[in-house]
């Protein structure tokens, strides 16, 4: 093999910290799955840098990945996902930085959708449903949500629920009246897959009854 | 539709230079790895060099590393091969060919040039 | 380095009838096994990938089959057209391989 850097990029090259994380979804793309990967430091001179997984693929030893603007990523179903593969930066022919990952140890499912909030009056409550693509996979299919809630005026103050499935019932008098509420969804694998929450779901938003003067409860 | 078309062949004396092109149209240059793929007369298919889709990496079997240089110009549409201290075997038709698959490297072939002869004698 | 050998170097058959070649490699190569078929004066034409799969708008008459080191291409049965040389090639590792051929003639 051949394609090696100029020494002197290879001497700077070894000046700059080329850290990096990544992550996988599986069965992003129909039967495809995809790994992504990025350095820590954004201002890393990417420009002659490569990304490689060799190790765990089906039919051959190495990959590489594509590069668009600051991100590397492969789509593919080539994955084993049995054992771990090696994850390099280089510079022509030369390692910068390796690492030994588990792609199933890195997974990031991907977000919910169709978050909805429908007030109950009988019953005095919010039912929350939002439904998640990774009910229909073949791997990830057990993931642990995350909602979150807060009224529009308290900034950072969140209330987090977690749950299994994919409904939640908010007891109204757990709830201020005659408010604004925002609520949003992520998830996290949750059974043998590991790795890292989803992106939060689009925001929804819901308002609360008043309070009835005369009953006290909200209409 | 997908074309590839090879450029620069000829006869060369032992130790000579010469550097094939490709011309291709009806993709995206830049998506794909590319190759060349030699066949000497009345023989078999031999593997030459690989380029990455960025032209970052090059592969070469030992029978020509250091002898031969594959590179590329995305904006020209052309694939290279400069093949330098040119020896009496590496006589053969040379093929440009893309693989299947665009980016990442799986290396089979579905597109191939018509071939260029390099005749290397004295 | 991975070897390619395939056999038989001439295989000799009747139309109508089914061919069998065979590539074996000297490296698992898990099913990263490609077959091409070539004509005199023609670039090759890929028939087969990943070992099994079925380029687009090659006749369903081909086949291919194997994982790791053995591999087999099988021709139900045989046209005019299918006469050439066939050639397997490995592309699970650097470098590139290919077998020294096949060659189906008519018996």
């Known amino acids: 093999e051949s394609g090696y850097a100029q020494n002197g990029d290879l001497e700077d090259a070894e000046l700059d910290d080329y850290s990096f994380s990544c992550y996988s979804q599986l069965e992003v793309n129909g039967s495809q799955h995809s790994l992504t990967c990025a350095f820590e430091d954004p201002d890393v001179n990417t420009t002659n840098l490569e990304f490689e997984i060799c190790g765990a693929l089906v039919e051959v030893k190495c990959l590489n990945f594509r590069k668009l603007q600051e991100i590397y990523f492969i789509e593919t179903k080539k994955f084993l996902l049995i054992g771990k593969s090696n994850i390099c930066v280089k510079v022509g022919e030369k390692s910068l930085t390796c690492k030994k990952i588990d792609l199933t140890t890195i997974v990031k499912p991907e977000a919910p959708f169709d978050l909805s909030v429908i007030y109950r009056e009988g019953a005095n409550d919010f039912v929350v449903t939002f439904n998640t693509s990774h009910l229909q996979k073949k791997y990830v299919k057990v993931l642990m949500h995350d909602v979150a809630y807060r009224q529009e005026k308290d900034e950072n103050k969140w209330t987090h629920v977690n749950l299994s499935s994919t409904k939640l019932t908010l007891l109204q008098r757990k709830l201020q009246p005659a408010a604004m509420y925002e609520i949003k969804v992520r998830s996290i694998p949750d059974h043998y897959f590991k790795g890292f929450w989803s992106e939060w779901s689009p925001s929804y938003y819901f308002r609360t009854p008043e309070i009835n003067n005369s009953s006290g409860e909200m209409d | 539709q997908v074309q590839l078309v090879e450029s620069g062949g000829g006869l060369v004396k032992p130790g000579g230079s010469l550097r094939l092109s490709c011309a291709v149209s009806g993709f995206t240059l830049s998506d794909y790895y590319m190759a060349w793929i030699r066949q000497a007369p009345g023989k078999g298919l031999e593997w030459v060099s690989t380029i990455s889709a960025s032209g970052l990496r090059t592969y070469y079997p030992d029978s020509v590393k250091g002898r031969f240089t594959i590179s590329r110009d995305n904006a020209k549409n052309s694939l290279y091969l400069q093949m330098n201290s040119l020896r009496a075997e590496d006589t053969a038709v040379y093929y440009c060919?893309?693989?299947?698959?665009?980016?990442?490297?799986?290396?089979?072939?579905?597109?191939w040039g018509q071939g260029t002869l390099v005749t290397v004698s004295s | 380095e991975i070897v390619m050998t395939q056999s038989p170097a001439t295989l000799s058959v009747s139309p109508g009838e089914r061919a069998t070649l065979s590539c074996r490699t000297s490296e698992d190569i898990y099913n990263g096994l490609a077959w091409y078929q070539q004509k005199p004066g023609q670039a090759p034409r890929l028939l087969i990938y990943s070992a099994n799969s079925l380029h687009i708008g090659i006749p369903a008459r081909f086949s291919g089959s194997g994982s790791g080191t053995e591999f087999t291409l099988t021709i139900s049965s045989l046209q005019s057209e299918d006469f050439a040389v066939y050639y397997c090639?490995?592309?699970?590792?650097?470098?590139?391989?290919f077998g020294g051929g096949t060659k189906v003639e008519i018996k």
């Open positions: 060919a893309r693989p299947m698959s665009a980016h990442y490297g799986f290396n089979y072939f579905d597109y």
């Open positions: 090639q490995q592309y699970y590792d650097y470098p590139l391989a």
